[in-house]
C-alpha cells in the first residue's frame, strides 16, 4: 500500500530515509533542459535493489558528434559513480532483505527527489545548520495504516535557532509545556481525522515552531 501524501514538514528540519522498503517508487526526474527516457519513468525497490537506473537525455534533437561524445562520457561517468557508491555506503543503510539503499545519483538528475513511500516506511528528521533540536521523543515519522487509510505519524522534534536553543533548556516552564500526550493508536473515531493532512502539519508542530525571518 502506497502512503498518501508526503511525510510531514518540520520547520527548519529535513528528513531522509535510512533505507527504503520493498515497493518504494522513485520518479526519474530530470533537470531543466533534459528529459527521461520514455521506458524509464521510475525506479522501484525490489527486495534489496532498484529495478532500473534513471537516465536523462538532452531535449535538443541535434545529434551532433559533440553530443554523442558527451553522452558516451555520461555513461562512463554513471558507471564510475555507481561503482564508487558501493564501498562508501552509510553504516545505517545495512543491506537488509526487503530494503533498498539510497540510489546513486544519475546524470542531469533534478535537484529534488520524489519518492512514493509504502506503508511501514520510516523517515528520520534532523535540524538544518544553524538550528538545534528540542526533542520530546523520536525524531522520526512512520507511514502507518489506520482506519483504512495510510498516514504519517508526527515527528516529536522542534528545531530552534542555535542562538536561542539554550534558553529553552534553561526554562522549566517551557520543558513542562512540551509534554504532549502520545498519539492514540487504538480506536477509530466515527469522524476520522486520523493523520495530519499536508496543509495541517505545520499547525500541529505546536508552540515551539520558529521561523527566523530577520537574520
Amino acid at each position: 500500500e502506497l502512503c498518501l501524501y508526503d511525510p510531514p514538514e518540520v520547520p527548519n528540519a529535513t528528513f531522509k530515509a535510512l533505507s527504503y522498503k520493498n515497493g518504494t517508487i522513485l520518479n526519474c526526474e530530470c533537470k531543466r533542459g533534459f528529459r527521461r527516457l520514455k521506458e524509464l519513468v521510475y525506479m522501484r525497490c525490489l527486495g534489496n535493489s532498484w529495478s532500473s537506473n534513471c537516465q536523462c537525455t538532452s531535449n535538443s534533437h541535434d545529434k551532433s558528434r559533440k553530443q554523442v561524445t558527451a553522452q558516451l562520457e555520461h555513461q562512463k561517468e554513471q558507471q564510475t559513480t555507481t561503482d564508487m557508491q558501493k564501498p562508501t555506503q552509510s553504516m545505517h543503510q545495512e543491506n537488509l532483505t526487503g530494503h533498498c539503499r539510497e540510489p546513486p545519483p544519475w546524470k542531469h538528475e533534478d535537484s529534488k527527489r520524489i519518492y512514493h513511500f509504502v506503508e511501514g516506511q520510516s523517515v528520520h528528521y534532523e535540524c538544518i545548520p544553524g538550528y538545534k533540536a528540542l526533542q520530546r521523543g523520536p525524531a522520526i515519522s512512520i507511514c502507518k495504516m489506520k482506519c483504512g487509510k495510510t498516514g504519517w505519524t508526527q515527528p516529536q522534534l522542534t528545531c530552534v535557532d542555535e542562538r536561542e536553543h539554550h534558553r529553552f533548556l534553561a526554562s522549566e516552564e517551557s520543558q513542562g509545556s512540551r509534554n504532549s500526550s502520545p498519539e492514540s493508536e487504538t480506536s477509530c473515531p466515527i469522524t476520522t481525522t486520523d493523520f495530519p493532512q499536508p496543509t495541517e502539519t505545520t499547525a500541529m508542530t505546536e508552540t515551539f515552531v520558529l521561523t527566523m525571518e530577520y537574520k
Partner: antibody, heavy 114, light 112 residues
Framework: QVKLLQSGAALEKPGASVKMSCKAS????????VIWVKQSHGKSLEWIGE????????NFNAKFKGKATLTVDKSTSTAYMELSRLTSEDSAIYYC???????WGQGVMVTVSS | DVVLTQTPPTLSATIGQSVSISCRSS???????????LYWLLQRPGQPPQLLIY???RLESGVPNRFSGSGSGTDFTLKISGVEAEDLGLYYC?????????FGAGTKLELK
C-alpha cells in the same frame, strides 16, 4: 528592520510599582525570547530575566524574583516588565533586548524618589 | 552565579593601535549542546549596548572585521586591530550559558 521601542521615563515614589513596555517590530515577535537588563548609574549590566512570548515561559535571576514580573501581549507584539515595591535601589535604566543580545531597545530611565 | 572578570578596567590607546581585552569566567562556558554562549558588547555614551561578537568568535553582521574574539572554556579575549575613534566606549563580555546570565564589569576604552 528589527526595532524594539520602549516606553518613556518614569518618576515613581518608594513603595509604588512601575510597568514599562517594549514594542517589537520587524520580526516574528512570538518566536524569540525577550530579555530584560538593568543598568544602574555608573555600574555594569544585570540580567533580570527573559520571557518566551509564544508560551509565556520565563527564566529569572533569583535576585529579581518577586521584584520583576514579565508578561507579553502577542496581539500587539509587546513585552512588559513590572517592578513592584520600588526603592531607590531600583533607580536605573532598563533595557529590553532580543535574539541573544543582538537587538536592544533605547532603554527606560526609572527614578525612584520621594 | 558565574562571575566574569574583565581586565583591564580601563584601556588607553592611540588611533591605529591594537588592543586586547580579557574576560575570565569562574566556570566553563561550554554548554552541553556544544555551543559556548559568550558575547562581546560595546556601549557608547548615552546609547544601549551593541553586539560585536557572539559564540566567542563569530562577528555580528555589520561589525568591522578589525574586531575579533577568541578563547574557550573559561578564558576569552576581544581584540581590536587598529583602534578607530568610533570604537571608544565601554566593552562588556556577557555569558548566557548559565542562568542567571551575567556580565563582566566592563572595560573602558579611551584615547591616550
Amino acid at each position: 528592520q528589527v526595532k524594539l521601542l520602549q516606553s518613556g521615563a518614569a518618576l515613581e515614589k518608594p513603595g509604588a510599582s512601575v510597568k514599562m513596555s517594549c514594542k517589537a517590530s520587524g520580526y516574528t515577535f512570538t518566536d524569540y525570547w525577550v530579555i530584560w537588563v538593568k543598568q544602574s548609574h555608573g555600574k555594569s549590566l544585570e540580567w533580570i530575566g527573559e520571557i518566551y512570548p509564544n508560551s509565556g515561559a520565563t527564566n529569572f535571576n533569583a535576585k529579581f524574583k518577586g521584584k520583576a514580573t514579565l508578561t507579553v501581549d502577542k496581539s500587539t507584539s509587546t513585552a512588559y516588565m513590572e517592578l513592584s515595591r520600588l526603592t531607590s535601589e531600583d533607580s536605573a535604566i532598563y533595557y529590553c533586548t532580543t535574539y541573544d543580545f543582538d537587538y536592544w531597545g533605547q532603554g527606560v530611565m526609572v527614578t525612584v524618589s520621594s | 552565579d558565574v562571575v566574569l572578570t574583565q581586565t583591564p578596567p580601563t584601556l588607553s590607546a592611540t588611533i591605529g593601535q591594537s588592543v586586547s581585552i580579557s574576560c575570565r569566567s569562574s566556570q566553563s562556558l561550554s554548554h552541553t549542546n556544544g555551543n559556548t554562549y559568550l558575547y562581546w558588547l560595546l556601549q557608547r555614551p548615552g546609547q544601549p549596548p551593541q553586539l560585536l561578537i557572539y559564540f566567542v568568535s563569530r562577528l555580528e553582521s555589520g561589525v568591522p572585521n578589525r574586531f575579533s574574539g577568541s578563547g574557550s572554556g573559561t578564558d576569552f579575549t576581544l581584540k581590536i586591530s587598529g583602534v578607530e575613534a568610533e570604537d571608544l566606549g565601554l566593552y562588556y563580555c556577557v555569558q548566557s550559558t548559565h542562568v542567571p546570565n551575567t556580565f563582566g564589569a566592563g572595560t573602558k576604552l579611551e584615547l591616550k
